[in-house]
Amino acid sequence: SITGISPITESLASLSTYNDQSITFALEDESYEIYVEDLKKDKKKDKVLLSYYESQHPSSESGDGVDGKMLMVTLSPTKDFWLQANNKEHSVELHKCEKPLPDQAFFVLHNRSFNCVSFECKTDPGVFIGVKDNHLALIKVDYSENLGSENILFKLSE
């Protein structure tokens, strides 16, 4: 459960891949599309509002206890729109929604090496936002093997 309905802090940052491709957002036919692309030098990077929430991490073995605390984020590139996990389609989409936000808009934030982070679906543990064919997608990760996979690593820069 998320401890409070209001975030503990917020920040604006641009989002890029491990390989320094930018995550950009474009309004097309009244809906937003998400792109992973090399930006031209003079083009300004899109910013995302990251809202951080403190959350309880349930004990994964007993299932009834609290294992500790974790940090969750929501990502909003423009007013009233949030990144959401579509677990059925294994896709990441931008949806207009009102607060309280649905669980699909929350991602566990993982601190990784090389100054990178990863975003794990709150609604589907072990599934992360990743890059597939120049788009964002949901990627299942085996903890014991692929946690360092470059396609789920992202950089946040102010």
Partner: antibody, heavy 119, light 111 residues
Amino acid sequence: DVNLVESGGGSVKPGGSLKLSCVASGFTFSSFSMSWVRQTPEKRLEWVATISGGKTFTDYVDSVKGRFTISRDDAKNTLYLQMSSLESEDTAMYYCTRANYGNWFFEVWGAGTTVAVSS
Amino acid sequence: DIVLTQSPGFLVVSLGQRATISCRASESVAKYGLSLLNWFQQKPGQPPKLLIFAASNRGSGVPARFSGSGSGTDFSLNIHPMEEDDTAMYFCQQSKEVPFTFGSGTKLEIK
């Protein structure tokens, strides 16, 4: 209950070796980043080494690089610290620690095991 | 390396009063908009215990009388009202970057 139990400490002469172990229980070990933190006799705390979940990354404090090796066996729920070329400055209580889920801070600590390096 | 300077080194506070411990970092410990500064309590013969993470968030089971504040380079831990059980050593620690570093500690006692 989440639990970390260290063992393997003892007295050793300078230049000697020791291998510390930490057995974890009560959580899915492979999902968490694990670290060793030591506390000197003067009560100073010093981070020693970290290994990520999935064994992908390791990091060390400069003073132990090339002498200490952190490793894990997820099948045995065990964290290790192989220490060689020990120096008197390595004398400390060694704590096994588990990061929180997401790897932002040291959330769980074991009771510690004592290492004494003296001639 | 980021150096954390804690003050005071020793603090005596009466029961029911406020204890304030400061921690100053040699450079900002902010990353991704988060202040990556944590506080630990250590009682004699025990390992450190997480009190506060990310500057102001209580760890699991930590009483509300413990609170953290600050940003950038200046942080503080407040304990109010002080209870007998709060007699301990307190350490700040940064998790912004390797090597993770700790403050030198503050010994807190009851008057």
